[in-house]
């Protein structure tokens, strides 16, 4: 019974750590800055990184610019977005700004999309200083379930920083869903 | 086989238990205001409470201002900054200032240290205003290994706000590597 | 002892799942904005939806305006908050604004209230512009114990906005206190 | 790389003028806070002149006060020393830098508080 007991909690240990990874997603998705969008109207980012640097992926799916929940959860969502602008690219079409964030989740079954978390500012870049800086944070616990996709909008995206510390977003599972 | 039974389950919730506690090290550092340096220029803050007010360590170690790796696994990793200056302090040397903070990481053996995250914000202080303030949020899910070591850098150190509320940095573990 | 061994899988499984599920409790309150105070000094903000929209709560209770804590645990709190204005809602008082959060726990054994994160910004909300915006963003991680308290206190209420993805606060379970 | 240069000295009468500029490139500094410093031959550096990022607040050397000012483009670089009604004694090499402090204090007229400084330029008076 000793032998059979060692080998009920051995093989346990393997079925509770192979699980409780099985369990948890996450995703880490940095900005591709080769191929960001112009223009100062909201757009949707659909260029990130996923296994290079900081970025990496395990159990979701990054595909067409979404990151695809593969798993029913209750996920933590962040973005960190990094705006800025040097006098050396040039004068600003307008001073006054809208730097935007929206962290958007999008149901296949019922094709409808719709905004969990936003965040930024009004500004002001004036032609007073050389170089502007501004950075949104937001962060909010999810209930996703699997096929939902979440994708990232912003305003202004030409004034993106494309450091893989400055422009994320991602994702990780904290508990399953009752 | 009843009271094997019985016993496995018991060394089981035991072990469990124990491995899960084991398995998630956390921090939560706030500012040690005595010692802050003084500068407009970039430093590395590196006097942080770790026992006092709602800062805390577990499976983690404080050491030279650095929050070091013990357990290797992803963290989710976070800093809150705050700045502020009255007009009592004294008189800016600057209106524009650039607010940053910076979460690097460094490792021993390969000596070098990257980004994680950074964030900010640059700022028109004017003297038409007796108080201002400002703060920086920034989050993300980061591998660490053992060893490795978390820093804080930020710009203009002389205007951070000293209350353990307002500039904190912390991680908390959240999964094992595969 | 095999079908022994079966059923201590399977009565482990159960009792695992089950622990798991009771051991992380969580919250995403969004506001409810048919009851926002108005004035600009620091209130405490009270009505907030639990169980509509993104808003959720599962194992903590939602009492008075006050998100109260059933089970002992480290936990990551986290509230967003935006601000806007509009030159339709009228003119601003001043525009010179302090626009700050503030998360604070309350002991109902020591009858006390302190603040476990702030956030915010003072801003200058011209006429020149027709819009204002600005959010925040705080995140932290911190010991509770059953029956505390989490309420979220605002400077300048009445410039909040309303929409669930730009004003909440949320807090889940991440481990067990040792 | 951080760079300060200056530009615009030169041979010059006693009694005439001449302005100094300094541009910042590498990294932003163009709205921190600057001093103008010289050198004189076989002389320790001595301080000229402070101003704050924005322009509003200026401070001088008590050798200098009345003849020389300092100003910044409201916008970006450089940042300007006009020197007028100058003496043989003002003979130096003059540096730019950068004030390393978030705060003005009152040791504002050091060199150790400044830090990024540039290679100089001579200004030379003479008849």
């Known amino acids: 019974i000793r032998a059979e007991k060692a080998m009920v909690d051995g093989s346990w240990l393997d079925l509770a750590k192979r699980s409780k990874l099985e369990a948890q997603p996450f995703a880490h998705l940095t900005i591709n800055a080769t191929d960001i969008p112009s223009g100062s109207h909201k757009v949707s980012l659909s260029s990130w990184y996923h296994d290079r640097g900081w970025a990496k992926i395990s159990n979701m799916t990054f595909s067409n610019g979404k990151l695809i929940v593969n798993q029913d959860g209750f996920y933590y969502l962040y973005a960190n977005i990094c705006f800025r602008h040097h006098e050396t690219s040039g004068d600003l079409a307008t001073e006054y700004l809208q730097l935007m964030v929206y962290v958007t989740k999008t149901s296949i079954k019922i094709p409808s999309s719709h905004t969990l978390m936003k965040g930024g500012s009004t500004k002001y870049w004036s032609g007073n200083s050389e170089f502007h800086f501004y950075s949104i944070n937001v962060g909010g616990f999810f209930k996703l379930r699997s096929g939902e996709e979440i994708s990232i909008e912003v305003s202004n995206p030409s004034l993106l920083d494309p450091d893989q510390d400055a422009t994320y977003f991602g994702a990780f599972k904290v508990r399953d869903i009752d | 086989i009843r009271a094997e039974k019985a016993m496995v389950d018991g060394s089981w919730l035991d072990l469990a238990k124990r491995s899960k506690l084991e398995a998630q090290p956390f921090a939560h550092l706030t500012i040690n205001a005595t010692d802050i340096p003084s500068g407009s220029h970039k430093v590395s803050l590196s006097s942080w409470y770790h026992d006092r007010g709602w800062a805390k360590i577990s499976n983690m170690t404080f050491s030279n201002g650095k929050l070091i790796v013990n357990q290797d696994g992803f963290y989710y990793l976070y800093a809150n900054i705050c700045f502020r200056h009255h007009e009592t302090s004294g008189d800016l040397a600057t209106e524009y200032l650039q607010l940053m903070v910076y979460v690097t990481k460094t490792s021993i053996k390969i000596p070098s240290s990257h980004t994680l995250m950074k964030g900010g914000s640059t700022k028109y202080w004017s003297g038409n205003s007796e108080f201002h303030f400002y703060s920086i949020n920034v989050g993300g899910f980061f591998k660490l290994r053992s060893g490795e070591e978390i820093s804080i850098e930020v710009s203009n150190p002389s205007l951070l706000d000293p209350d353990q509320d307002a500039t904190y940095f912390g991680a908390f573990k959240v999964r094992d590597i595969d | 002892i095999r079908a022994e061994k079966a059923m201590v899988d399977g009565s482990w499984l159960d009792l695992a799942k089950r622990s798991k599920l009771e051991a992380q409790p969580f919250a995403h309150l969004t506001i409810n904005a048919t009851d926002i105070p108005s004035g600009s000094h620091k209130v405490s903000l009270s009505s907030w939806y639990h169980d509509r929209g993104w808003a959720k709560i599962s194992n903590m209770t939602f009492s008075n305006g006050k998100l109260i804590v059933n089970q002992d645990g480290f936990y990551y709190l986290y509230a967003n908050i935006c601000f806007r204005h509009h030159e339709t809602s009228g003119d601003l008082a001043t525009e010179y604004l302090q626009l700050m959060v503030y998360v604070t726990k309350t002991s109902i054994k020591i009858p006390s209230s302190h603040t476990l994160m702030k956030g915010g910004s003072t801003k200058y909300w011209s006429g020149n512009s027709e819009f204002h915006f600005y959010s925040i963003n705080v995140g932290g991680f911190f010991k509770l114990r059953s029956g505390e308290e989490i309420s979220i206190e605002v400077s300048n209420p009445s410039l909040l906005d309303p929409d669930q993805d730009a004003t909440y606060f949320g807090a889940f379970k991440v481990r067990d206190i040792d | 790389e951080v760079q300060l240069v200056e530009s615009g000295g030169g041979l010059v009468q006693p009694g005439g003028s001449l302005r100094l500029s300094c541009a910042a490139s590498g990294r932003t500094f163009s709205r921190s806070a600057m001093g103008w410093f010289r050198q004189a031959p076989g002389k320790g550096r001595e301080f000229v002149g402070f101003i704050t990022g924005s322009g509003g607040t200026t401070y001088y050397g008590e050798s200098v006060k009345g003849r020389f000012t300092i100003s910044r483009d409201n916008a970006q670089n450089p940042v300007y020393l006009q020197m007028n009604s100058l003496r043989p004694e003002d003979t130096a090499v003059y540096y730019c830098?950068?004030?390393?402090?978030?705060?003005?204090?009152?040791?504002?007229?050091?060199?150790?508080?400044?830090?990024?400084w540039g290679q100089g330029t001579l200004v030379t008076v003479s008849s």
């Open positions: 830098a950068v004030y390393r402090r978030t705060y003005i204090s009152s040791t504002y007229s050091e060199s150790s508080e400044y830090d990024y």
